[in-house]
């Protein structure tokens, strides 16, 4: 398919950076100014995309790649090619309507991004709680109880290293 | 305005050399597929040679061998460097500005004026 349509499209082999001009009987032309085209053949060249505002620009337009933004300090890229910013807020807290809020007890955060999530419930993993959980961390589930029985070690030691030439007794 | 101005042709014996040229301007000559055709007296316009931008060349059976085409995008030229003439080599030759930079089944999109290549004893 691909050989049938470069042998019928006389733009296929305009290549990236340019555009095939049908003003001027389809002979290729440079994209203009702050426009770009990323594969052969095109008709037209893209605009190229403005990081503005809240926007800021990672990588510049060329000829044959589009600007690339992310966001100023303070906000986070969310949605494919960072097609967003959304506010930053502190570890423990999540962004409501009304902006930054603490998260509920029994609940934490541990990035500046993202929602408050429950600590996880060690009992149902017959666990104890061996730290607790605070608003920016999530609880550490410690051993369960019978782990803790008599002779029984929460840590299992290291094998002792033998030496070399030395069967076990 | 795309401009395309042919020279070098004349008068060769059979067995001899001649270099067109074809001065390019009002476009991205770089980005551009460039050709030469001929047209012998009483005849159709037939293909001679194509170059793409990215210097792939493309021959008429009847000059493979004889004839080579090249280009220097910083003077804007194509040439036709034509050796072992003929008698059957005798046209006008023209310079051709290629359609969306093909040379496989290339199309035309403007022509220039011509040079008159003449073989003979």
């Known amino acids: 398919f691909e050989r049938t349509r470069s042998l019928q499209d006389p733009c296929s082999n305009c290549p990236a950076g340019t555009f095939c001009d049908n003003n001027r009987n389809q002979i290729c032309s440079p994209c203009p100014p702050n426009s770009f085209s990323s594969a052969g053949g095109q008709r037209t060249c893209d605009i190229c995309r403005q990081c503005k505002g809240v926007f800021r620009t990672r990588k510049e337009c060329s000829s044959t790649s589009n600007a690339e933004c992310d966001c100023t300090p303070g906000f986070h890229c969310l949605g494919a090619g960072c097609s967003m910013c959304e506010q930053d807020c502190k570890q423990g807290q999540e962004l409501t309507k009304k902006g930054c809020k603490d998260c509920c007890f029994g609940t934490f955060n541990d990035q500046k991004r993202g929602i408050c999530r429950p600590w996880t419930n060690c009992s149902l993993d017959g666990k104890s709680v061996l730290v607790n959980g605070t608003k920016e961390r999530d609880v550490v589930c410690g051993p369960s109880p019978a782990d803790l029985s008599p002779g029984a070690s929460s840590v299992t030691p290291p094998a002792p290293a033998r030496e070399p030439g030395h069967s076990p007794q | 305005e795309v401009q395309l101005l042919e020279s070098g042709g004349g008068e060769v014996q059979p067995g001899g050399s001649l270099r067109l040229s074809c001065a390019a301007s009002g476009f991205s000559f770089s980005i551009n597929a460039m050709s030469w055709y001929r047209q012998a007296p009483g005849k159709r316009r037939e293909f001679v040679a194509a170059?793409?931008?990215?210097?792939?060349?493309v021959y008429a059976e009847s000059v493979k061998g004889r004839f080579t085409i090249s280009r220097d995008n910083a003077k804007n030229t194509v040439y036709l460097q034509m050796s072992s003439l003929r008698a059957e080599d005798t046209a006008v030759y023209y310079c051709?500005?290629?359609?969306?930079?093909?040379?496989?089944?290339?199309?035309?999109?403007?022509w220039g004026q011509g040079t008159l290549v003449t073989v003979k004893p």
């Open positions: 051709g500005l290629l359609k969306g930079n093909r040379v496989v089944s290339p199309s035309v999109a403007y």
């Open positions: 170059i793409e931008s990215g210097r792939n060349t």
